[in-house]
Amino acid sequence: KKVVLGKKGDTVELTCNASQKKNTQFHWKNSNQIKILGIQGLFLTKGPSKLSDRADSRKSLWDQGCFSMIIKNLKIEDSDTYICEVENKKEEVELLVFGLTANSDTHLLEGQSLTLTLESPPGSSPSVKCRSPGGKNIQGGRTISVPQLERQDSGTWTCTVSQDQKTVEFKIDIVVLAFQKASSTVYKKEGEQVEFSFPLAFTLEKLTGSGELWWQAERASSSKSWITFDLKNKEVSVKRVTQDPKLQMGKKLPLHLTLPQALPQYAGSGNLTLALEAKTGKLHQEVNLVVMRATQFQENLTCEVWGPTSPKLTLSLKLENKGATVSKQAKAVWVLNPEAGMWQCLLSDSGQVLLESNIKVVPTW
């Protein structure tokens, strides 16, 4: 017998063809021999089965010898062997209906787990293979689990259910609620304005919640809250802000913070936490601030950086248009009795300049 796989909620067409391409008597019955539908004269008649209100046939194809049965809004319990009786012969079609659903809301926070559950008819032994938008393949039986969702898991998951060499494909849209970046670093010269941006990796029609930026300055012994805020329908309202620094926050998304001046005492790292209404858990983005200061005091030219820098970063003092350079993989470099001219302090990573500050050394007569 022929096997046909269907999807819960979908429509399936079970075909039955007569050898004669003409209108003739036919009946569709279920495995209990209960009539579902058939032809009486020129009219479609329906039997007492549970399917009667969801079953139909393509009348336009009857005169071509095609006596298909269409079942709408499929249910798992529609799985059965259906018999088409036409021209004194019986054609059997086994219909297996599957459903694949996410156990929870399909809007999940980064790090949360996703469980997909397969509904299948009794006696079937299907296998499921899912492919994430990022190309990750996961296999399973009745359930498929993704223990820790990542932001690249956002999008349409394609899951293939296989049974008796037949397949049916499901598409499930998953939205991973996360910031676009897990971490970002801002490099600034002392005194410059600092802009922190926290773009989200998703869009929701109504976005409501609350958040906080918690900051650990490199020079401070303990961390503290820099700003707390509420988010109502994508509108940001500041709840409380520290007095030093005097932070400002944008009123619209993406979340945007402005620090009027980069100062050594602010250099450090922060964690912006966002709690969304009706969601368990919080979104996090780490942000780092690195501040550079170049100073000349008496016979000493010094360049310093504060904040989280990796050990492989190089700090250099270089005299413009001259070869004189001092470089160190350290957070401070200095030159004693520097030559007059424009000196550059450079913070670089494998030759790529991240931050530079110029200081003019005037000749001492």
Partner: antibody, heavy 119, light 107 residues
């Protein structure tokens, strides 16, 4: 180590006044909002008032508005609560607490000072 | 003012039991909710802030959940040192308000 030590409690007659103090140490006092919370004998906690870092913003529970005044002296690392027109229902243990926790939580509390209003 | 209603007002439980305390706000408070533990004669101490985040040093048997107006504090396996009174508190709007407390007693 963060420490908050309240003082100034005692027995006072209805209509009388008291000034509670809270001496802070072990942290940069001027960087934090501070709160007063009270607890009547055998009862639950009631938030009374709070004050921002420089004393320019103050908030009170309705039942004490116009009678109690919160203030601070950052030079002395001290928080104060002036209690006037005291009533029997103001009898409670008064705690000072630092609003230094994440999500505006009260992360450090003093051991409290008892105020008894009775004739 | 936002009213915070805790239930139950007291619960008798044994060591190892799972205890659940609920807190309902009279209006939405987003995630501005903290839970405190208070032992007799002592000052309260914060257990959980922002609905579900642990204060450092708080054992993982304590957990918080909920959103909007309904919140839960769960102690997964009650320990002898957990017998105390627990309070929820909102910091969404002034005046800040506490629940009336839930006393966890030894059965």
């Amino acid at each position: 180590e963060v420490q908050l030590v309240e003082s100034g409690g005692g027995l006072v007659q209805p209509g009388g006044s008291l000034r509670l103090s809270c001496a802070a140490s072990g942290f940069t006092f001027s960087s934090y909002w501070m709160s007063w919370v009270r607890q009547a004998p055998g009862k639950g906690l009631e938030w009374v008032a709070n004050i921002n870092q420089d004393g320019s913003e103050k908030y009170y529970v309705d039942s004490v508005k116009g009678r109690f005044t919160i203030s601070r002296d950052n030079a002395k690392n001290s928080l104060y609560l002036q209690l006037n027109s005291l009533r029997a229902e103001d009898t409670a243990m008064y705690y000072c607490a630092r609003e230094g926790g994440q999500w505006l939580s009260l992360d450090y509390w003093g051991q409290g000072t008892l105020v008894t209003v009775s004739s | 003012d936002i009213q915070m209603t805790q239930s139950p007002s007291s619960v008798s439980a044994s060591v190892g039991d799972r205890v659940t305390i609920t807190c309902r706000a009279s209006q939405g408070i987003s995630s501005w909710l903290a839970w405190y533990q208070q032992k007799p004669g002592k000052a309260p101490k914060v257990l959980i802030y922002g609905v579900s985040s642990f204060q450092s040093g708080v054992p993982s048997r304590f957990s918080g959940s909920g959103s909007g107006t309904d919140f839960i504090l769960t102690i997964s396996s009650l320990q002898p040192e957990d017998f105390a009174t627990y309070y929820c508190q909102q910091a969404n709007s002034f005046p800040w308000t506490f629940g009336q407390g839930t006393k966890v007693e030894i059965k």
